[in-house]
Interface confidence: low
Protein backbone atom coordinates (compact mmCIF):
# COMPACT_ATOMS: atom_id res chain seq x y z
CA UNK A 1 0.00 0.00 0.00
CA UNK A 2 1.05 3.37 -0.55
CA UNK A 3 2.52 5.55 2.26
CA UNK A 4 0.56 8.51 3.06
CA UNK A 5 0.83 10.78 5.97
CA UNK A 6 -2.30 12.09 7.28
CA UNK A 7 -3.30 14.91 9.53
CA UNK A 8 -7.28 15.46 9.35
CA UNK A 9 -7.09 18.37 11.42
CA UNK A 10 -5.75 21.79 10.05
CA UNK A 11 -5.62 23.37 13.07
CA UNK A 12 -6.74 22.81 16.79
CA UNK A 13 -7.67 25.25 19.98
CA UNK A 14 -6.37 24.68 23.00
CA UNK A 15 -6.79 26.57 26.19
CA UNK A 16 -3.43 27.40 28.31
CA UNK A 17 -3.30 24.81 30.97
CA UNK A 18 -5.29 21.92 29.45
CA UNK A 19 -4.05 19.20 26.78
CA UNK A 20 -4.45 18.93 22.99
CA UNK A 21 -3.99 15.90 20.68
CA UNK A 22 -1.80 16.22 17.29
CA UNK A 23 -3.36 13.12 15.18
CA UNK A 24 -1.54 11.59 12.60
CA UNK A 25 -1.84 8.46 11.00
CA UNK A 26 0.13 6.33 8.13
CA UNK A 27 -1.04 4.37 5.40
CA UNK A 28 2.14 1.96 5.62
CA UNK A 29 4.27 1.33 7.65
CA UNK A 30 6.75 0.58 4.71
CA UNK A 31 9.80 1.72 3.95
CA UNK A 32 11.22 1.20 7.48
CA UNK A 33 12.08 4.01 9.78
CA UNK A 34 10.83 6.74 12.23
CA UNK A 35 8.24 9.25 12.66
CA UNK A 36 9.17 12.54 13.98
CA UNK A 37 7.25 15.37 14.96
CA UNK A 38 8.70 18.84 14.09
CA UNK A 39 7.17 22.25 15.17
CA UNK A 40 7.88 24.15 12.54
CA UNK A 41 9.47 24.06 8.63
CA UNK A 42 12.80 24.47 7.42
CA UNK A 43 16.49 24.31 9.11
CA UNK A 44 15.46 25.83 12.23
CA UNK A 45 12.48 23.42 13.13
CA UNK A 46 12.24 22.21 16.34
CA UNK A 47 12.01 18.04 16.97
CA UNK A 48 9.55 17.60 19.63
CA UNK A 49 8.88 14.21 19.68
CA UNK A 50 10.77 10.51 17.66
CA UNK A 51 9.20 7.54 19.24
CA UNK A 52 12.26 6.47 20.26
CA UNK A 53 11.10 5.78 23.96
CA UNK A 54 13.07 8.73 25.70
CA UNK A 55 11.50 10.53 28.46
CA UNK A 56 10.24 14.27 26.61
CA UNK A 57 7.89 16.57 29.61
CA UNK A 58 4.36 16.77 28.92
CA UNK A 59 4.43 14.67 25.92
CA UNK A 60 3.03 11.29 25.23
CA UNK A 61 2.21 8.94 22.69
CA UNK A 62 -1.79 8.14 22.13
CA UNK A 63 -1.09 4.81 21.46
CA UNK A 64 1.18 1.84 21.81
CA UNK A 65 3.22 2.10 18.68
CA UNK A 66 5.80 -0.81 19.89
CA UNK A 67 2.58 -3.23 18.70
CA UNK A 68 3.77 -4.48 14.91
CA UNK A 69 0.51 -2.98 13.17
CA UNK A 70 0.37 0.38 14.91
CA UNK A 71 -0.10 3.17 12.46
CA UNK A 72 -1.16 6.03 14.60
CA UNK A 73 1.47 8.08 15.84
CA UNK A 74 -0.61 11.15 17.52
CA UNK A 75 0.44 12.99 20.76
CA UNK A 76 -0.70 14.40 23.31
CA UNK A 77 0.76 17.53 24.93
CA UNK A 78 -0.35 18.73 28.59
CA UNK A 79 -0.17 21.81 30.04
CA UNK A 80 -0.23 24.08 26.78
CA UNK A 81 1.92 27.28 27.33
CA UNK A 82 1.53 29.76 25.32
CA UNK A 83 5.25 28.81 23.79
CA UNK A 84 3.43 25.66 22.31
CA UNK A 85 2.22 27.82 19.73
CA UNK A 86 2.87 26.84 15.91
CA UNK A 87 2.47 24.52 12.92
CA UNK A 88 3.37 20.64 14.09
CA UNK A 89 4.54 17.99 11.27
CA UNK A 90 3.97 14.53 11.83
CA UNK A 91 7.12 13.14 9.28
CA UNK A 92 7.82 9.95 8.19
CA UNK A 93 12.04 9.27 7.54
CA UNK A 94 13.18 6.27 5.90
CA UNK A 95 16.15 4.64 8.01
CA UNK A 96 19.54 4.49 6.18
CA UNK A 97 21.86 2.21 6.52
CA UNK A 98 24.92 4.60 6.78
CA UNK A 99 24.05 7.71 5.94
CA UNK A 100 21.37 9.63 8.33
CA UNK A 101 18.03 8.96 7.65
CA UNK A 102 16.01 10.15 4.92
CA UNK A 103 12.79 12.00 5.15
CA UNK A 104 10.39 11.12 2.75
CA UNK A 105 7.00 12.12 3.40
CA UNK A 106 5.36 14.80 5.84
CA UNK A 107 1.72 15.05 7.18
CA UNK A 108 -0.04 18.48 5.86
CA UNK A 109 0.57 20.30 8.96
CA UNK A 110 -1.72 21.18 12.20
CA UNK A 111 -1.51 24.55 13.36
CA UNK A 112 -2.06 24.82 17.53
CA UNK A 113 -3.64 27.64 18.20
CA UNK A 114 -2.82 28.73 22.40
CA UNK A 115 -5.57 30.10 24.01
CA UNK A 116 -4.77 32.37 26.55
CA UNK A 117 -6.80 34.69 28.39
CA UNK A 118 -6.19 38.62 28.15
CA UNK A 119 -5.28 40.41 31.51
CA UNK A 120 -7.77 42.15 33.24
CA UNK A 121 -7.86 45.89 31.37
CA UNK A 122 -6.08 48.60 33.31
CA UNK A 123 -7.47 52.11 32.10
CA UNK A 124 -5.35 55.00 33.17
CA UNK A 125 -6.09 58.68 32.45
CA UNK A 126 -4.60 62.12 33.03
CA UNK A 127 -2.05 62.58 35.70
CA UNK A 128 -4.32 66.04 36.01
CA UNK A 129 -7.64 66.86 36.94
CA UNK A 130 -9.71 68.28 34.02
CA UNK A 131 -12.28 70.83 33.60
CA UNK A 132 -15.83 71.21 31.99
CA UNK A 133 -15.03 71.16 28.21
CA UNK A 134 -11.44 69.94 28.11
CA UNK A 135 -10.81 66.69 26.04
CA UNK A 136 -8.71 64.23 28.04
CA UNK A 137 -6.97 60.88 26.82
CA UNK A 138 -7.70 57.49 28.96
CA UNK A 139 -5.80 54.60 27.58
CA UNK A 140 -6.72 50.98 28.36
CA UNK A 141 -4.00 48.15 28.42
CA UNK A 142 -4.37 44.47 28.44
CA UNK A 143 -1.73 41.64 27.61
CA UNK A 144 -0.78 38.17 27.69
CA UNK A 145 -4.10 36.99 25.43
CA UNK A 146 -3.96 34.39 22.22
CA UNK A 147 -4.99 34.23 19.52
CA UNK A 148 -4.54 37.58 18.07
CA UNK A 149 -7.97 38.75 17.50
CA UNK A 150 -9.78 40.39 20.21
CA UNK A 151 -12.10 43.37 20.29
CA UNK A 152 -12.08 45.96 22.48
CA UNK A 153 -14.63 48.80 23.08
CA UNK A 154 -15.07 51.98 24.71
CA UNK A 155 -18.14 53.34 26.83
CA UNK A 156 -18.66 56.27 28.93
CA UNK A 157 -21.92 55.83 30.78
CA UNK A 158 -23.57 53.12 28.30
CA UNK A 159 -22.64 54.75 25.29
CA UNK A 160 -20.12 53.14 22.79
CA UNK A 161 -17.37 55.74 22.00
CA UNK A 162 -15.35 55.53 19.02
CA UNK A 163 -10.88 55.06 20.22
CA UNK A 164 -8.39 57.36 19.08
CA UNK A 165 -6.21 54.52 18.01
CA UNK A 166 -5.66 50.93 18.90
CA UNK A 167 -2.89 48.36 18.29
CA UNK A 168 -2.04 45.22 18.84
CA UNK A 169 1.46 44.32 19.34
CA UNK A 170 3.29 42.48 18.05
CA UNK A 171 1.98 42.82 14.29
CA UNK A 172 3.11 39.74 13.06
CA UNK A 173 3.04 35.98 14.85
CA UNK A 174 3.82 35.45 18.54
CA UNK A 175 3.07 33.20 21.66
CA UNK A 176 1.29 35.96 23.12
CA UNK A 177 -0.41 39.47 22.26
CA UNK A 178 -0.69 42.88 24.07
CA UNK A 179 -3.59 45.40 23.10
CA UNK A 180 -3.32 49.15 23.51
CA UNK A 181 -6.57 51.60 23.08
CA UNK A 182 -6.72 55.28 23.24
CA UNK A 183 -10.23 56.96 23.96
CA UNK A 184 -10.45 60.95 24.12
CA UNK A 185 -13.70 62.39 25.97
CA UNK A 186 -14.46 65.79 26.75
CA UNK A 187 -15.46 66.02 30.62
CA UNK A 188 -19.19 67.74 31.00
CA UNK A 189 -19.60 68.87 34.51
CA UNK A 190 -22.39 66.68 34.75
CA UNK A 191 -19.24 63.94 34.92
CA UNK A 192 -18.54 63.38 38.63
CA UNK A 193 -20.67 60.40 38.34
CA UNK A 194 -19.70 59.42 34.99
CA UNK A 195 -17.68 56.13 34.04
CA UNK A 196 -15.17 55.23 31.28
CA UNK A 197 -15.33 51.87 30.85
CA UNK A 198 -12.96 49.46 28.37
CA UNK A 199 -14.35 46.34 27.47
CA UNK A 200 -12.43 43.49 26.11
CA UNK A 201 -13.75 40.20 24.35
CA UNK A 202 -11.67 37.69 23.49
CA UNK A 203 -12.65 34.03 22.55
CA UNK A 204 -11.21 32.84 25.68
CA UNK A 205 -13.55 34.79 27.66
CA UNK A 206 -16.87 32.47 27.22
CA UNK A 207 -18.90 35.82 25.87
CA UNK A 208 -18.23 37.51 29.10
CA UNK A 209 -15.85 40.60 28.47
CA UNK A 210 -13.80 42.33 31.02
CA UNK A 211 -13.80 45.55 32.28
CA UNK A 212 -11.84 48.32 33.16
CA UNK A 213 -13.15 51.05 34.26
CA UNK A 214 -12.30 54.53 35.30
CA UNK A 215 -14.51 56.97 37.45
CA UNK A 216 -14.03 60.25 35.87
CA UNK A 217 -14.60 61.56 39.69
CA UNK A 218 -10.85 60.95 39.61
CA UNK A 219 -10.15 62.83 36.98
CA UNK A 220 -12.21 65.86 36.71
CA UNK A 221 -12.63 69.23 38.65
CA UNK A 222 -15.39 71.23 38.66
CA UNK A 223 -15.08 74.66 40.09
CA UNK A 224 -17.96 76.27 42.55
CA UNK A 225 -19.94 78.94 41.65
CA UNK A 226 -19.49 81.53 44.71
CA UNK A 227 -22.33 83.99 45.60
CA UNK A 228 -22.68 86.14 49.06
CA UNK A 229 -26.13 87.17 49.85
CA UNK A 230 -27.01 89.24 52.63
CA UNK A 231 -30.02 88.03 55.14
CA UNK A 232 -32.63 90.28 56.49
CA UNK A 233 -31.38 91.46 59.71
CA UNK A 234 -32.14 89.29 62.92
CA UNK A 235 -32.37 92.10 65.16
CA UNK A 236 -31.13 95.76 65.48
CA UNK A 237 -27.65 94.71 66.40
CA UNK A 238 -26.66 91.80 64.10
CA UNK A 239 -26.12 91.48 59.85
CA UNK A 240 -26.27 87.56 58.72
CA UNK A 241 -23.88 87.40 55.55
CA UNK A 242 -24.08 83.23 53.61
CA UNK A 243 -21.29 82.35 51.51
CA UNK A 244 -22.68 80.13 48.71
CA UNK A 245 -20.22 77.46 47.08
CA UNK A 246 -22.24 75.43 44.99
CA UNK A 247 -21.97 72.60 42.65
CA UNK A 248 -18.41 71.85 43.38
CA UNK A 249 -16.14 68.75 42.92
CA UNK A 250 -13.77 66.94 44.26
CA UNK A 251 -14.56 67.87 48.02
CA UNK A 252 -11.68 69.97 49.14
CA UNK A 253 -12.55 73.02 49.92
CA UNK A 254 -11.13 76.33 51.99
CA UNK A 255 -13.26 79.07 52.98
CA UNK A 256 -12.12 81.93 54.61
CA UNK A 257 -14.38 85.54 55.46
CA UNK A 258 -12.12 88.50 55.65
CA UNK A 259 -13.23 91.90 56.80
CA UNK A 260 -11.58 95.17 54.72
CA UNK A 261 -9.11 92.67 53.85
CA UNK A 262 -8.24 91.54 57.15
CA UNK A 263 -8.72 87.48 58.00
CA UNK A 264 -11.71 87.80 60.04
CA UNK A 265 -12.68 83.53 60.33
CA UNK A 266 -11.10 80.75 58.48
CA UNK A 267 -13.76 78.22 57.85
CA UNK A 268 -13.31 74.30 57.17
CA UNK A 269 -16.05 72.76 55.70
CA UNK A 270 -17.16 69.33 57.22
CA UNK A 271 -20.99 68.94 56.57
CA UNK A 272 -21.13 69.10 52.57
CA UNK A 273 -24.38 68.66 50.80
CA UNK A 274 -23.87 66.56 48.19
CA UNK A 275 -26.20 67.28 44.90
CA UNK A 276 -27.50 64.08 42.88
CA UNK A 277 -24.99 64.82 40.47
CA UNK A 278 -22.04 64.49 42.63
CA UNK A 279 -21.00 67.79 43.26
CA UNK A 280 -21.17 69.15 46.52
CA UNK A 281 -22.46 72.15 47.80
CA UNK A 282 -21.48 74.50 50.72
CA UNK A 283 -22.57 77.20 53.33
CA UNK A 284 -20.81 79.39 55.58
CA UNK A 285 -23.01 81.84 57.52
CA UNK A 286 -21.45 84.98 59.15
CA UNK A 287 -23.16 87.04 61.92
CA UNK A 288 -21.61 90.40 62.02
CA UNK A 289 -22.24 92.44 64.78
CA UNK A 290 -23.36 95.84 63.41
CA UNK A 291 -22.96 98.07 66.88
CA UNK A 292 -18.89 97.55 66.38
CA UNK A 293 -19.42 99.03 62.63
CA UNK A 294 -19.77 102.68 62.13
CA UNK A 295 -18.19 102.83 58.88
CA UNK A 296 -18.67 101.22 55.62
CA UNK A 297 -17.05 97.42 55.76
CA UNK A 298 -16.26 95.27 52.55
CA UNK A 299 -16.65 91.89 53.69
CA UNK A 300 -14.75 89.35 51.20
CA UNK A 301 -15.83 85.31 51.16
CA UNK A 302 -12.64 83.61 49.86
CA UNK A 303 -13.16 80.36 48.54
CA UNK A 304 -10.10 78.08 47.46
CA UNK A 305 -10.91 74.97 45.84
CA UNK A 306 -8.57 71.38 45.10
CA UNK A 307 -5.44 73.62 45.22
CA UNK A 308 -6.73 76.88 42.59
CA UNK A 309 -6.59 79.94 43.27
CA UNK A 310 -9.22 81.61 44.99
CA UNK A 311 -12.49 82.85 43.93
CA UNK A 312 -13.76 85.66 45.83
CA UNK A 313 -16.58 87.52 46.37
CA UNK A 314 -17.24 91.25 47.79
CA UNK A 315 -20.11 92.45 50.01
CA UNK A 316 -19.74 95.92 50.91
CA UNK A 317 -22.56 97.21 54.04
CA UNK A 318 -22.79 100.42 54.63
CA UNK A 319 -22.06 101.98 58.23
CA UNK A 320 -24.42 103.39 60.42
CA UNK A 321 -23.20 106.58 60.06
CA UNK A 322 -24.45 106.13 56.62
CA UNK A 323 -28.20 105.46 57.65
CA UNK A 324 -30.56 108.49 57.87
CA UNK A 325 -34.05 105.57 58.09
CA UNK A 326 -33.28 102.73 60.75
CA UNK A 327 -35.22 100.22 58.44
CA UNK A 328 -33.46 101.37 55.56
CA UNK A 329 -31.40 98.93 53.41
CA UNK A 330 -29.81 99.17 50.33
CA UNK A 331 -28.49 96.16 47.71
CA UNK A 332 -26.57 96.96 44.59
CA UNK A 333 -27.16 94.31 42.05
CA UNK A 334 -23.41 92.52 41.21
CA UNK A 335 -21.12 90.42 42.96
CA UNK A 336 -19.74 93.17 45.16
CA UNK A 337 -23.45 93.90 47.05
CA UNK A 338 -23.67 96.88 49.13
CA UNK A 339 -26.19 96.81 51.92
CA UNK A 340 -26.68 99.52 55.09
CA UNK A 341 -25.81 98.46 58.59
CA UNK A 342 -29.44 97.84 60.70
CA UNK B 1 -1.98 58.59 -3.46
CA UNK B 2 -4.13 56.09 -1.88
CA UNK B 3 -6.97 54.67 -3.86
CA UNK B 4 -9.38 51.94 -3.21
CA UNK B 5 -10.88 48.98 -5.73
CA UNK B 6 -13.89 47.01 -4.45
CA UNK B 7 -14.64 43.51 -6.61
CA UNK B 8 -17.03 40.76 -6.10
CA UNK B 9 -19.93 39.60 -7.49
CA UNK B 10 -22.88 41.58 -8.88
CA UNK B 11 -25.61 38.94 -8.16
CA UNK B 12 -25.95 36.92 -5.25
CA UNK B 13 -28.99 34.37 -4.43
CA UNK B 14 -30.93 34.83 -1.46
CA UNK B 15 -29.63 33.06 1.83
CA UNK B 16 -26.35 33.23 0.15
CA UNK B 17 -23.05 34.88 1.76
CA UNK B 18 -22.07 38.20 -0.36
CA UNK B 19 -18.49 38.46 -0.61
CA UNK B 20 -16.48 41.73 -1.71
CA UNK B 21 -12.91 42.64 -1.43
CA UNK B 22 -11.41 45.86 -1.65
CA UNK B 23 -7.94 46.11 -2.78
CA UNK B 24 -5.32 49.14 -1.63
CA UNK B 25 -2.87 50.64 -3.77
CA UNK B 26 -0.07 53.97 -3.81
CA UNK B 27 -0.05 52.61 -0.09
CA UNK B 28 0.13 50.29 2.67
CA UNK B 29 -2.72 49.03 4.72
CA UNK B 30 -0.07 48.26 7.60
CA UNK B 31 1.14 51.30 7.35
CA UNK B 32 -1.28 52.37 10.14
CA UNK B 33 -3.35 55.65 11.41
CA UNK B 34 -6.11 54.67 9.65
CA UNK B 35 -9.36 52.99 9.46
CA UNK B 36 -10.74 50.39 7.04
CA UNK B 37 -14.36 51.07 6.32
CA UNK B 38 -17.27 49.65 4.20
CA UNK B 39 -20.62 51.58 3.49
CA UNK B 40 -23.56 51.08 1.87
CA UNK B 41 -26.02 52.74 -0.31
CA UNK B 42 -29.49 51.52 -0.66
CA UNK B 43 -30.90 52.67 -4.66
CA UNK B 44 -31.95 56.26 -3.95
CA UNK B 45 -31.53 56.38 -0.34
CA UNK B 46 -28.43 57.24 2.00
CA UNK B 47 -25.35 56.62 3.38
CA UNK B 48 -25.31 53.35 6.06
CA UNK B 49 -21.51 52.56 7.65
CA UNK B 50 -21.20 48.54 8.18
CA UNK B 51 -18.09 48.52 9.75
CA UNK B 52 -14.29 49.07 9.83
CA UNK B 53 -11.36 47.22 10.28
CA UNK B 54 -7.92 48.97 11.82
CA UNK B 55 -4.85 47.18 10.26
CA UNK B 56 -3.97 45.53 13.54
CA UNK B 57 -7.23 43.80 14.02
CA UNK B 58 -9.82 45.52 16.26
CA UNK B 59 -12.73 45.82 14.37
CA UNK B 60 -15.85 47.81 14.49
CA UNK B 61 -19.22 46.79 13.22
CA UNK B 62 -22.68 48.30 12.76
CA UNK B 63 -25.07 46.77 15.42
CA UNK B 64 -27.99 46.39 13.04
CA UNK B 65 -25.60 44.31 10.76
CA UNK B 66 -23.43 42.68 13.33
CA UNK B 67 -24.70 39.24 13.53
CA UNK B 68 -24.06 38.50 9.74
CA UNK B 69 -21.00 41.06 9.06
CA UNK B 70 -17.31 39.71 8.81
CA UNK B 71 -14.47 42.45 7.79
CA UNK B 72 -11.19 41.08 7.76
CA UNK B 73 -7.74 42.40 6.25
CA UNK B 74 -4.89 40.43 4.55
CA UNK B 75 -1.58 43.02 4.78
CA UNK B 76 0.23 40.41 2.72
CA UNK B 77 -2.09 41.12 -0.49
CA UNK B 78 -2.53 44.97 0.58
CA UNK B 79 -7.12 44.08 0.93
CA UNK B 80 -9.51 44.28 3.09
CA UNK B 81 -12.98 42.29 2.72
CA UNK B 82 -16.41 42.09 3.87
CA UNK B 83 -18.75 39.19 3.88
CA UNK B 84 -22.65 39.63 4.58
CA UNK B 85 -24.16 36.55 5.41
CA UNK B 86 -27.86 35.15 5.03
CA UNK B 87 -28.50 38.05 2.19
CA UNK B 88 -32.12 39.05 1.33
CA UNK B 89 -33.21 41.84 -1.07
CA UNK B 90 -32.97 44.28 1.42
CA UNK B 91 -29.26 44.17 0.88
CA UNK B 92 -29.46 44.86 -2.34
CA UNK B 93 -27.12 48.37 -2.58
CA UNK B 94 -24.29 50.10 -3.81
CA UNK B 95 -21.15 49.23 -1.71
CA UNK B 96 -18.16 51.31 -1.46
CA UNK B 97 -14.77 50.43 0.79
CA UNK B 98 -13.58 53.73 2.18
CA UNK B 99 -9.90 54.91 4.01
CA UNK B 100 -10.38 56.96 7.15
CA UNK B 101 -8.04 58.68 9.52
CA UNK B 102 -9.61 59.52 12.64
CA UNK B 103 -9.21 63.41 12.06
CA UNK B 104 -9.53 63.52 8.42
CA UNK B 105 -12.29 62.01 7.50
CA UNK B 106 -13.14 59.22 4.60
CA UNK B 107 -10.89 61.25 2.47
CA UNK B 108 -10.47 58.00 -0.29
CA UNK B 109 -13.20 55.89 -1.96
CA UNK B 110 -13.24 53.23 -4.06
CA UNK B 111 -16.22 54.16 -6.82
CA UNK B 112 -18.65 51.32 -5.48
CA UNK B 113 -19.51 48.13 -6.67
CA UNK B 114 -23.45 47.53 -7.20
CA UNK B 115 -24.80 43.93 -5.39
CA UNK B 116 -28.34 42.77 -6.27
CA UNK B 117 -29.52 40.15 -4.65
CA UNK B 118 -31.98 37.91 -6.30
CA UNK B 119 -32.39 34.49 -7.36
CA UNK C 1 -27.25 55.44 17.82
CA UNK C 2 -26.58 58.94 17.25
CA UNK C 3 -29.99 60.55 14.81
CA UNK C 4 -28.26 62.74 12.54
CA UNK C 5 -31.18 64.91 11.37
CA UNK C 6 -30.30 67.27 8.21
CA UNK C 7 -32.56 70.20 6.41
CA UNK C 8 -33.91 70.70 4.29
CA UNK C 9 -34.38 67.37 2.21
CA UNK C 10 -33.68 69.36 -0.89
CA UNK C 11 -33.40 73.10 -1.73
CA UNK C 12 -33.12 74.76 -5.25
CA UNK C 13 -31.09 77.75 -5.73
CA UNK C 14 -29.70 80.45 -8.34
CA UNK C 15 -26.23 80.25 -9.14
CA UNK C 16 -24.40 82.48 -6.92
CA UNK C 17 -26.39 82.16 -4.11
CA UNK C 18 -25.45 81.55 -0.64
CA UNK C 19 -27.11 77.93 0.33
CA UNK C 20 -26.63 76.90 3.98
CA UNK C 21 -28.11 73.56 4.94
CA UNK C 22 -27.95 72.04 8.98
CA UNK C 23 -27.24 69.10 10.45
CA UNK C 24 -28.34 68.49 14.38
CA UNK C 25 -27.22 65.27 16.06
CA UNK C 26 -29.62 63.89 18.72
CA UNK C 27 -26.43 64.33 21.64
CA UNK C 28 -23.44 66.31 21.84
CA UNK C 29 -20.81 65.39 19.42
CA UNK C 30 -18.54 68.10 19.91
CA UNK C 31 -16.95 68.96 16.34
CA UNK C 32 -16.79 65.00 15.42
CA UNK C 33 -18.33 65.34 12.20
CA UNK C 34 -18.10 65.28 8.52
CA UNK C 35 -19.57 66.75 4.98
CA UNK C 36 -19.44 65.11 1.95
CA UNK C 37 -20.79 65.56 -1.77
CA UNK C 38 -21.97 62.62 -3.76
CA UNK C 39 -22.64 63.47 -7.63
CA UNK C 40 -25.40 61.02 -9.23
CA UNK C 41 -23.39 57.53 -9.86
CA UNK C 42 -20.50 58.70 -7.87
CA UNK C 43 -18.44 57.77 -5.05
CA UNK C 44 -19.01 60.34 -2.09
CA UNK C 45 -15.99 63.17 -1.84
CA UNK C 46 -14.90 64.60 1.32
CA UNK C 47 -15.43 68.54 1.92
CA UNK C 48 -15.54 68.92 5.35
CA UNK C 49 -13.67 67.33 8.51
CA UNK C 50 -13.82 67.87 12.26
CA UNK C 51 -16.88 70.15 11.09
CA UNK C 52 -14.93 73.21 10.16
CA UNK C 53 -11.90 71.96 8.32
CA UNK C 54 -11.61 72.02 4.41
CA UNK C 55 -10.16 69.05 2.97
CA UNK C 56 -7.57 69.06 0.50
CA UNK C 57 -7.82 70.44 -2.78
CA UNK C 58 -11.65 71.57 -1.95
CA UNK C 59 -12.54 75.49 -3.22
CA UNK C 60 -13.14 77.76 -0.28
CA UNK C 61 -16.55 78.41 -1.27
CA UNK C 62 -17.39 75.44 0.63
CA UNK C 63 -17.13 75.76 4.83
CA UNK C 64 -18.46 74.22 7.68
CA UNK C 65 -19.24 75.36 11.17
CA UNK C 66 -21.08 74.36 14.91
CA UNK C 67 -20.01 72.21 17.74
CA UNK C 68 -22.08 70.00 20.15
CA UNK C 69 -25.24 69.55 18.53
CA UNK C 70 -25.82 71.92 15.87
CA UNK C 71 -23.84 72.23 13.02
CA UNK C 72 -23.86 74.38 9.19
CA UNK C 73 -22.60 73.74 5.96
CA UNK C 74 -22.58 76.80 3.65
CA UNK C 75 -21.86 77.52 0.04
CA UNK C 76 -20.78 80.93 -0.39
CA UNK C 77 -21.27 81.12 -3.91
CA UNK C 78 -23.32 77.96 -5.57
CA UNK C 79 -21.38 77.32 -8.72
CA UNK C 80 -23.88 74.60 -11.49
CA UNK C 81 -20.80 71.92 -10.71
CA UNK C 82 -22.08 71.86 -6.67
CA UNK C 83 -25.25 69.94 -8.34
CA UNK C 84 -25.21 67.16 -5.66
CA UNK C 85 -26.46 65.57 -2.69
CA UNK C 86 -24.63 66.68 0.32
CA UNK C 87 -24.46 64.40 4.24
CA UNK C 88 -22.88 65.28 6.85
CA UNK C 89 -21.67 62.36 9.38
CA UNK C 90 -20.64 62.24 12.82
CA UNK C 91 -17.79 59.24 14.42
CA UNK C 92 -18.05 60.35 18.36
CA UNK C 93 -19.81 57.79 18.67
CA UNK C 94 -20.42 53.95 17.14
CA UNK C 95 -21.84 53.40 14.75
CA UNK C 96 -20.64 55.96 12.65
CA UNK C 97 -24.24 57.69 11.46
CA UNK C 98 -25.14 59.99 8.57
CA UNK C 99 -27.34 62.36 8.33
CA UNK C 100 -30.65 61.61 5.71
CA UNK C 101 -28.46 63.77 2.89
CA UNK C 102 -29.60 67.43 1.17
CA UNK C 103 -30.50 67.17 -2.86
CA UNK C 104 -29.04 70.21 -4.51
CA UNK C 105 -30.45 71.77 -7.17
CA UNK C 106 -30.35 74.60 -9.53
CA UNK C 107 -32.99 77.21 -10.28
Known amino acids: KELKVTQPEKSVSVAAGDSTVLNCTLTSLLPVGPIRWYRGVGPSRLLIYSFAGEYVPRIRNVSDTTKRNNMDFSIRISNVTPADAGIYYCVKFQKGSSEPDTEIQSGGGTEVYVLAKPSPPEVSGPADRGIPDQKVNFTCKSHGFSPRNITLKWFKDGQELHPLETTVNPSGKNVSYNISSTVRVVLNSMDVNSKVICEVAHITLDRSPLRGIANLSNFIRVSPTVKVTQQSPTSMNQVNLTCRAERFYPEDLQLIWLENGNVSRNDTPKNLTKNTDGTYNYTSLFLVNSSAHREDVVFTCQVKHDQQPAITRNHTVLGFAHSSDQGSMQTFPDNNATHNWN | QVQLQESGPGLVKPSQTLSLTCTVS??????????WSWIRQHPGKGLEWIGA???????YYNPSLKSRVTISVDTSKNQFSLKLSSVTAADTAVYYC???????????WGQGTTVTVSS | DIQMTQSPSSLSASVGDRVTITCQAS??????LNWYQQKPGKAPKLLIY???NLATGVPSRFSGSGSGTDFTFTISSLQPEDIATYYC?????????FGGGTKVEIK
Open chain 2, 98 to 108: SKEGYHSGMDV
Open chain 2, 26 to 35: GGSISSGGYY
Open chain 2, 53 to 59: IYYSGPI
Open chain 3, 27 to 32: QDISNY
Open chain 3, 50 to 52: DAS
Open chain 3, 89 to 97: QQFAYLPWT
